[in-house]
């Protein structure tokens, strides 16, 4: 499909001249950021961004690639080097430590320097590093964590926890030896390490004693509480704050977000991770966009400002399953949340960053025609005389041999939300990829986001922009961060 | 491998504070660019950049990812949307039209708007679009094209040619019907469309009549001249300029580049594409770095400045072969050329851009240990109990079934320069990928390179920065572009 207007050079020349005009008008703000928002697309490498752009565009009856994601509108871009201290290709724990605490750690550890060793409890103490969220709280800001995964998952945990094992969600996941050495599960740290004003996502089961039925799935005890210490962490958290509210469904969330008596809000909408957007029961579970809006309504009451972490956490899960449909629809919802946040905040006082913790071995090739489905087939046949999809994975569970050969695929099969794209190597879970990811920035001090940087730079930019430790002498005026 | 110094949070905090300091010091230059250099890594997507960084670092006995490519040091980064008007995933012809002429075209066409149709000669006339190089020449600058492919290849041809078929290298490749309609081969256009001061790369055979033996391979007639029109285009080109020199080997190139009587230089060092860097005979063929240096020596004599196109064109070829070793060693040589150019020019008056025309379905995953070979195996085994490499392709010629199964691989096999990484889908040639590519910028007006842009924006930034058409009223002072 060739759009007629695009045949004319004037179309492109005018468009580029407008883009140049916009570029020339860009003026770095010299003010501090009152508010900080970091949007984290878990596993959202550049190939995911592009494919999601095309899909989002096509959902609006456009050809696709010429459209804009909300993140595409952010004026500043950098590339972020995601390796962990011990691995070329990192996990979401070590990377969370980097972009939330400003220090690189080791694979599968969270909130700890690289002096800590995976799974070795006795290497925890003394190696804790402090997140920007924690520093923002100390500076009097309100803080929040919003995610589509469990709130105890690696990425959000980087904002509040310190653990040598990212899988220690509840005490049932922590070996007795580690518990005896004083290592706490992540759910316990969520309510005890610091005061978080808004906590929204999944992860109910880690908060309640084993045998506590889940309110949404009371007959499924694999979804019920998992704790072995008998603690009801939600009850403990509620007891800490007079204006605290706990909600577990969408209706309660929307009510609580509009209730001026609510000062602290915990919403846990699934026992584990929240459902994929395509599977979400919109009567029971809020979308990431709705959670983001609820968080902003509460946090923005604080005249000193806020810090908010928003994660599209299941982009990653879709890719691990080699189900690009899931990964890309999650990315679109993530982008919708970015768009909504943009409508509810001002770039005059809010530094917004969008980035990924790492990428995936996900590619988009095969010379498809413009306007063709992102989930469709490449033109022509492969060397084995079979069709192939434009989306493919380097490794993952999509590898199948049928009668000793690669299976054929039809357009209707490849368009299914359940379809697993093929891969070169068969793995139970497709792996992360190690290439640089993009950082998109808008708002005060966004111009500092430039070039190729270590992933740690992200945390430092946020801290500097809001004059938080160790940049309290930031020399940014007016100090929009302290307007009370 | 965990470097001891990286275990200390101070290491990361200091490093990030320095990076912040550098970011704060960045001052957009308000001057025009006297000189323009565009470095084009053909097929150099972000995954290629990262993998090449690690390889280059390891060649210097470092662990890899913590090191810097020359392009990493460029202060400004943007993302470029590479789709062509008719395809989600483009080729090097349509993309060259975009970044060199500022207008998007159709797949496999060059220097033509999208009103032109692939292979339809009669859609050429009236749809030509003019490159920034051509405009620079008209403004009195010297201009040059340097590539490791044949100089008539799609990417360099975007600087000077207009053709509905990128494969029309010599008249022997153009159907008689098209020739009768007046469509010229690319080699003819190279010497006749505009005055190019420096032309360095491969592509000898397209310049000479069929039956002309090649000077380097006189006994191999498949390497000799291909032209059917009896023309010796080199002779014709030499006749146009009093100070013109033609060279075909490294020794002659180095001599010519230092000869003040040489005003125009054409160096064609192979009959077709130049050899991969790993196969190059360094006594006969210059490296891309050496060609870049030679070009800069000649072009920088012009007080009005210059435009230079430098292409690492065989990065793409390595990927098409699914031979990552070739692609990455080509990328390193490309980066070495960028580094050398940086030493020979000043960012006070030279806008340098580094970008790719498109990416490849090339991925780097599998959680390898830091410091392990980029060509090595992932830790653990795949689901089929066989080893697998960290580098893989979505599609390509690396797909092999051995006794109805995926072949096993050893570290020594995967480290071979000839090894083809496995792919999900068997193709004769691995395909391009459609995700956004990076644009790195340094020098006057480099700050305009920001955010997510159409690929066409690159040409417009160059034109604006040097006050070329259509931006002659650029309002940039001092007009460093006209210092004579």
């Amino acid at each position: 499909i060739i759009p007629v207007e695009e045949e004319n050079p004037d179309f492109w020349n005018r468009q580029a001249a407008e883009a140049l005009g916009a570029a020339k008008k860009l003026q770095p703000a010299q003010t501090a950021a009152k508010n900080l928002i970091i949007f984290l697309g878990d596993g959202m490498g550049v190939s995911t961004v592009t494919a999601a752009r095309i899909l989002k565009g096509q959902k609006k009856d456009k050809l696709g690639p010429e459209t804009f994601l909300a993140m595409d509108r952010f004026p500043y871009v950098a590339l972020s080097k995601t390796y962990s201290v011990d691995k070329h290709v990192p996990d979401s724990g070590a990377t969370a430590t980097a972009y939330l605490c400003g220090v690189k750690g080791n694979f599968q550890t969270i909130g700890l320097s690289a002096a800590a060793r995976f799974n070795q409890c006795n290497t925890t103490r003394g190696n804790e590093v402090i997140s920007v969220m924690n520093r923002a709280k100390k500076a009097g800001k309100s803080v929040g964590v919003v995610t589509t995964t469990r709130v105890q998952h690696a990425s959000p945990a980087g904002a509040y926890a310190h653990t040598v094992n990212r899988n220690w969600y509840s005490d049932a996941d922590v070996p007795a030896s580690a518990r005896q050495e004083g290592c706490q599960d992540i759910a316990t740290q969520l309510i005890s390490n610091m005061d978080i004003d808004v906590i929204l996502g999944g992860g109910r089961k880690y908060m309640f004693p084993m045998g506590t039925p889940d309110p949404e799935y009371p007959d499924d005890y694999s979804q019920g509480g998992t704790r072995l210490d008998g603690k009801n962490l939600v009850q403990e958290w509620l007891a800490k704050h007079q204006g605290a509210r706990y909600v577990w469904n969408r209706t309660e969330l929307l009510q609580a977000s509009l209730d001026p008596s609510v000062t602290h809000l915990m919403g846990l909408f699934e026992p584990g991770d929240m459902k994929y957007e395509i599977h979400r029961d919109s009567t029971l579970d809020p979308s990431l966009m709705e959670m983001t809006e609820a968080a902003l309504l509460l946090l923005s009451r604080n005249p000193r400002g806020f810090f908010l972490f928003v994660e599209g956490g299941r982009i990653d899960h879709g890719h691990h399953e080699s189900r690009a449909y899931r990964a890309l629809t999650e990315t679109i919802m993530f982008d919708d949340a970015i768009e909504r946040a943009g409508q509810l905040t001002s770039e005059e006082d809010t530094l917004s960053l969008v980035t990924a913790d790492h990428s995936h071995v996900f590619s988009f090739g095969g010379y498809p025609l413009r306007g063709s489905s992102i989930f469709g087939l490449a033109p022509g046949k492969a060397r084995d005389r079979k069709a192939y999809t434009v989306l493919l994975y380097g490794n993952g569970p999509g590898y199948v041999l049928k009668d000793g050969a690669r299976p054929d695929v039809t357009e209707s099969e490849s368009g299914s939300p359940e379809y697993r794209q093929q891969s070169a190597v068969p793995l139970d879970g497709e792996t992360h990829a190690g290439e640089d990811v993009a950082v998109f920035a808008r708002g005060p001090q966004a111009h500092l986001v430039h070039g190729v940087q270590e992933q740690t730079f992200i945390a430092h930019v946020m801290a500097f922009a809001a004059c938080l430790e160790p940049y309290t002498a930031c020399d940014l005026a007016p100090r929009a961060g302290t307007t009370d | 491998i965990i470097p001891v110094e990286e275990e200390n949070p101070d290491f990361w905090n200091r490093q990030a504070a320095e990076a912040l300091g550098a970011a704060k010091k960045l001052q957009p230059a308000q001057t025009a660019a006297k000189n323009l250099i565009i470095f084009l890594g053909d097929g150099m997507g972000v995954s290629t950049v990262t993998a090449a960084r690690i390889l280059k670092g390891q060649k210097k006995d470092k662990l890899g990812p913590e090191t810097f490519l020359a392009m990493d040091r460029f202060p400004y980064v943007a993302l470029s949307k590479t789709y062509s008007v008719d395809k989600h995933v483009p080729d090097s012809g349509a993309t060259a039209t975009a970044y060199l002429c500022g207008v998007k075209g159709n797949f496999q066409t060059i220097g033509l708007s999208a009103a032109a149709r692939f292979n339809q000669c009669n859609t050429t006339r009236g749809n030509e679009v003019i490159s920034v190089m051509n405009r620079a020449k008209k403004a009195g600058k010297s201009v040059g094209v340097v590539t490791t492919t044949r100089v008539q290849h799609a990417s360099p041809a975007g600087a000077y040619a207009h053709t509905v078929n990128r494969n029309w290298y010599s008249d022997a490749d153009v159907p008689a019907s098209a020739r009768q309609e007046g469509c010229q081969d690319i080699a003819t256009q190279l010497i006749s469309n505009m005055d190019i001061d420096v032309i360095l790369g491969g592509g000898r055979k397209y310049m000479f009549p069929m039956g002309t033996p090649d000077p380097e391979y006189p006994d191999d007639y498949s390497q000799g001249g291909t032209r059917l029109d009896g023309k010796n285009l080199v002779q014709e080109w030499l006749a146009k300029h009093q100070g013109a020199r033609y060279v075909w080997n490294r020794t002659e190139l180095l001599q010519a580049s230092l000869d003040p009587s040489v005003t125009h230089l054409m160096g064609l060092f192979e009959p077709g594409d130049m050899k991969y860097e790993i196969h190059r005979d360094s006594t006969l063929d210059p490296s891309l770095m050496e060609m870049t240096e030679a070009a800069l020596l000649l072009l920088s004599r012009n007080p009005r400045g210059f435009f230079l196109f430098v292409e690492g064109g065989r990065i793409d070829h390595g990927h098409h072969e699914s031979r990552a070793y070739r692609a990455l060693t080509e990328t390193i040589m490309f980066d070495d050329a960028i580094e050398r150019a940086g030493q020979l020019t000043s960012e006070e008056d030279t806008l340098s851009l580094v970008t790719a025309d498109h990416s490849h379905v090339f991925s780097f995953g599998g959680y390898p240990l830091r410091g392990s070979s980029i060509f090595g195996l992932a830790p653990g085994k795949a689901r089929d109990r066989k080893a697998y490499t960290v580098l893989l392709y979505g599609n390509g010629p690396g797909y092999v079934l051995k006794d109805g199964a995926r072949p096993d691989v050893t570290e020594s096999e995967s480290g071979s320069p000839e090894y083809r990484q496995q792919s999900a889908v068997p193709l004769d040639g691995e395909t391009h990928a459609g995700e956004d590519v990076a644009v790195f910028a340094r020098g006057p007006q480099a700050h305009l390179v920001h955010g997510v842009q159409e690929q066409t924006f690159i040409a417009h930034v160059m034109a604006f920065a040097a006050c070329l058409e259509p931006y002659t009223a650029c309002d940039l002072a001092p007009r460093a572009g006209t210092t004579d």
Epitope: W168, A172, M210, Y221, S222, G230 | -
Partner: antibody, heavy 120, light 111 residues
Framework: QQQLEESGGDLVQPGASLTLTCTAS?????????MCWGRQAPGKGLEWIGC???????TYYANWAKGRFTISKTSSTTVTLQMTSLTAADTATYFC?????????????WGPGTLVTVSS | IVMTQTPSSKSVPVGDTVTINCQAS????????LAWYQQKPGQSPKLLIY???ILDSGVPSRFKGSGSGTQFTLTISDVVCDDAATYYC????????????FGGGTELVVK
């Protein structure tokens, strides 16, 4: 069909050691399962020995069993019970059992049992 | 934790209702970690009820569990011949040592 089977039961001398193996078929243990061992002396009631929680390989034992009995996960489908310093009082049918997913105190899948006889 | 079952044996006619009691020496974990098992001679135990009142899949609704904390009851209504077996309660105190224990068992004879 999901099944458990114990193996390794034998006639041994007092003071000897013995390792019993519990093998799953039709499923593999996930992190929400507790794998437990119990025993039943001839004509007597059931006695709990201990469990292993698959999520973190934590083990929990009855007071009387601690030190002499060790439960280990050896693969995603096998669990072992190592017993040392056996006495006649340890003569029993030994059962392995899998918990309801997420509920460590309820065992809904049992093996048929294997007989251990300690006698000189 | 010590689980005490009463009675140790019970004889009931077909169609009657029978109640078996189980007392824990201290509160079970979360006040609900109590399970009931049925064992027939020469067979492995079979789970009937867990978390004090939840019927395991495939168990007839004639079986009912109740109670909380330290006092629990198993009620079998409309007893049938096939219900003849020994019934055990099992309590879980937590991840402390000696975390679980079975009761002594109640033998049910159906007349």
């Amino acid at each position: 069909q999901q099944q458990l089977e114990e193996s390794g039961g034998d006639l041994v001398q007092p003071g000897a050691s013995l390792t019993l193996t519990c093998t799953a078929s039709g499923f593999s243990f996930n992190s929400n399962y507790w794998m437990c061992w119990g025993r039943q002396a001839p004509g007597k009631g059931l006695e709990w020995i201990g469990c292993i929680l698959f999520g973190n390989t934590d083990t929990y034992y009855a007071n009387w069993a601690k030190g002499r009995f060790t439960i280990s996960k050896t693969s995603s489908t096998t669990v072992t019970l190592q017993m040392t310093s056996l006495t006649a009082a340890d003569t029993a049918t030994y059962f392995c059992a899998r918990s309801v997913s997420g509920v460590g105190s309820a065992w809904n899948l049992w093996g048929p049992g294997t007989l251990v006889t300690v006698s000189s | 934790i010590v689980m005490t079952q009463t009675p140790s044996s019970k004889s009931v006619p077909v169609g009657d209702t029978v109640t078996i009691n189980c007392q824990a020496s201290e509160s079970v974990y979360n006040n609900n970690h109590l399970a009931w098992y049925q064992q027939k001679p020469g067979q492995s135990p079979k789970l009937l009820i867990y978390l004090a009142s939840i019927l395991d899949s495939g168990v007839p609704s004639r079986f009912k569990g109740s109670g909380s904390g330290t006092q629990f009851t198993l009620t079998i209504s409309d007893v049938v011949c096939d219900d003849a077996a020994t019934y055990y309660c099992a309590g879980y105190k937590g991840i402390t040592i000696d975390g679980s224990a079975f009761g002594g068992g109640t033998e049910l004879v159906v007349k």
